[in-house]
């Protein structure tokens, strides 16, 4: 009995034409939503003039349907038992699941003004940029619609820059009509314990963003894991959104629509400083903003974002050090709302429900040569938005899953 089930599972989780896993893998049967909350700045002038604390008020959710497109360019390699693919990106606004429209306006940090002196640290270039910032009437903060902020707008200051640079700015620009990948993952045909584990990403086994082992691409993409998951196992996965591999540990057993699943959670020590978790030393790549690598809860992903000062954290700076959140007022971190978890069915290793939560922040520093930033007396890691990407197995799929998998085992 058990041997037969194990054999069936091993056959059905292989990523090749005709298996249950493959069909769901090519195009997820789960509806995935990405909710956004935007941090609306309440005191922009006070901050720019007096370097006050930034008062923010989150507004949302604004919901989009994502991950509805099938994987493309799927190519099996029988030689090394891998399958390669790209994951197309797309987002469709869902007005009925949102508090407003894509035209709602927000006061947020001026992304281009904040990034320019960080990217161009040469003072002469900054003097030139300052004249263009003034000419374009740009300042430290700006008012932008949701659509502009997320998906891109033509920046008036960058449009004046006399050498060829991209003049379109957006937190997720470009997104629609782009792809993530190429991913090359093990199909599990020769070794089921390697199924879905990423062999390479964009043709490389390392990211080239981090020193040492932090640069490794570990585990799967979190949509599934090798079968027969034990509670003691650490689930490793790579997230291109945060430009790194990360891990989840067992949290609790949960009943999901009659299916017993293991809830794996991202532990606080994944975001700890090297002082608290020495394994994280290679995620600390600069000494100033990190207070000599003692700050925690924020990840500088600038190297992965063409040098832009982008920092990733958990929403509301959950699990972040006080020095990070101190200059910001209006944040209320909450473990239940703001943590990331994966609900994994242990026999198949399939993730049947998940909530990926992250916050996008931009570093803005005093810049002597940029008038809009020269009154700042300290650097700020400014929250722009946080997102909650969720997916849950549908009722029909859950019934089918119970019949075919968990039912048989009982």
């Amino acid at each position: 009995g058990d041997m037969l089930i194990e054999k069936t599972i091993k056959r059905e989780v292989v990523l090749e034409e005709g298996t249950t896993a493959f069909k769901n893998w090519v195009k997820t049967g789960t509806t995935v939503y990405r909710q956004f909350w935007i941090f609306d700045v309440q005191n922009p002038d006070d901050v720019a003039k007096n370097s006050s604390k930034i008062k923010v008020k989150q507004r949302g959710p604004y919901t989009y349907r994502v991950r509805y497109l099938a994987k493309e360019n799927i190519t099996q390699d029988p030689e090394d038992h891998t399958v390669s693919f790209v994951q197309p990106n797309g987002a469709i606004f869902e007005p009925s699941l949102s508090v407003g429209t894509e035209d709602d306006n927000f006061t947020v940090l001026n992304l281009a003004v904040a990034a320019a002196p960080h990217i161009y640290q040469n003072s002469f270039v900054q003097v030139v940029l300052n004249s263009l910032i003034k000419k374009s009437k740009s300042s430290m903060f700006q008012t932008r619609s949701l659509k502009e902020l997320l998906w891109g707008y033509k920046d008036p200051f960058l449009s004046l820059v006399p050498y060829p640079i991209s003049t379109t700015v957006g937190v997720f620009y470009p997104y629609n009509d782009t792809v993530d990948g190429v991913y090359k993952v093990f199909n599990g045909k020769d070794n089921i314990s390697k199924v879905a584990i990423i062999e390479s990403y964009k043709g490389k086994r390392n990211l080239s963003y981090w020193p040492s082992y932090c640069d490794m691409i570990n585990g799967t993409d979190a949509a599934s894991f090798p079968p027969f998951v034990e509670k003691s196992r650490t689930l490793r996965f790579f997230s291109s959104d945060i430009c790194r591999s990360i891990y989840a540990v067992f949290g609790s057993e949960i009943d999901l629509k009659g299916i017993p699943v293991y809830r794996f959670v991202l532990p606080a020590n994944a975001f700890a400083s090297p002082l608290q978790n020495p394994d994280n030393h290679c995620f600390c790549t600069e000494k100033v903003i990190s207070n000599n690598c003692t700050s925690y809860g924020v990840l500088d992903i600038g190297k992965c974002k063409e040098g832009k000062p982008v920092y990733i954290s958990l929403p509301h700076f959950l699990h972040a050090s006080p020095d990070v959140s101190e200059p910001i007022e209006g944040l209320h971190p909450n473990e239940d709302e703001h943590r990331t978890y994966l609900d994994v069915e242990p026999i198949t290793g399939f993730t049947l429900q998940f909530a990926k939560r992250l916050q996008v922040n931009i570093l803005v520093k005093p810049a002597r040569k940029i008038e809009a930033l020269k009154n700042l007396k300290r650097p700020y890691i400014v929250p722009i938005l946080w997102l909650n990407e969720t997916g849950t197995i549908g009722d029909e799929k859950a019934e089918m899953f119970k019949t075919q998998v968990t039912g048989k085992i009982k």
Epitope: Q121, N122, S123, F124, V125, V128, N130, P162, R368, K369
Partner: antibody
Framework: EVQLQQSGPELVKPGASVKISCKTS????????MHWVKQSHGKSLEWIGG????????AYNQKFKNKATLTVDISSNTAYMALRSLASDDSAVYYC???????????????WGQGTLVTVSA | ETTVTQSPASLSVATGEKVTIRCITS??????MNWYQQRPGEPPNLLIS???TLRPGVPSRFSSSGYGTDFVFTIENTLSEDVADYYC?????????FGSGTRLEIK
């Protein structure tokens, strides 16, 4: 040791053009800004413009916008200034001057070439 | 364009005396003022950079002060080797502009 070596003196006719060079050594060329400064005989200094070799970005004093063109050749660590439609009031010593900012305060025009005398005469 | 007015145009002092040169700008430039020395037949030499910062290797008898629009450059205990033209340069905004210069002579 940082050195900026400028090309020799030029005697040119009114209406003609001239191209002055400034060869650098002793530092990473792309990391330093290069400026050009004019000094007419017995007079003060005037900033003509600057170029950032890293990305070729330039900025000019409007007064010299139609007079000077700044370029660089990264392969030879050399900066150039071309002057066109020369007239007698363009007769001057022209200096190249570079500066480096990373983590060293804000020192402008730290290193200077020896100057190139351009004489415009019929 | 920020205009820089430098005074005096020339001055003559005995060695050991104090020299004061003043530059006034037409716009507020914070402390983005620089000071140069140009000896005869040589290119200018940066003595003091923005923020009244004395450059490495420059003798401590040279100093500057000022913020906004009014700036002063001082030489304490002038030496004969200080004979030169002195220029101020504002580096706050484009185009960068120099003062008209001050010629220092020794009596």
């Amino acid at each position: 040791e940082v050195q900026l070596q400028q090309s020799g003196p030029e005697l040119v006719k009114p209406g003609a053009s001239v191209k002055i060079s400034c060869k650098t050594s002793g530092y990473t060329f792309t990391e330093y800004t290069m400026h050009w400064v004019k000094q007419s005989h017995g007079k003060s200094l005037e900033w003509i413009g600057g170029i950032y070799p890293y990305n070729g970005g330039t900025a000019y004093n409007q007064k010299f916008k139609n007079k000077a063109t700044l370029t660089v050749d990264i392969s030879s660590n050399t900066a150039y200034m071309a002057l066109r439609s020369l007239a007698s009031d363009d007769s001057a010593v022209y200096y190249c001057a570079s500066d480096y900012f990373y983590g060293d305060g804000y020192p402008w025009f730290t290193y200077w070439g020896q100057g190139t005398l351009v004489t415009v005469s019929a | 364009e920020t205009t820089v007015t430098q005074s005096p145009a020339s001055l003559s002092v005995a060695t050991g005396e104090k020299v004061t040169i003043r530059c006034i700008t037409s716009t507020d430039i914070d402390d983005d003022m620089n000071w140069y020395q140009q000896r005869p037949g040589e290119p200018p030499n940066l003595l003091i950079s923005e923020g009244n910062t004395l450059r490495p290797g420059v003798p401590s008898r040279f100093s500057s002060s000022g913020y906004g629009t009014d700036f002063v450059f001082t030489i304490e205990n002038t030496l004969s080797e200080d004979v030169a033209d002195y220029y101020c340069l504002q580096s706050d905004n484009l185009p960068f502009t120099f003062g008209s210069g001050t010629r220092l002579e020794i009596k």
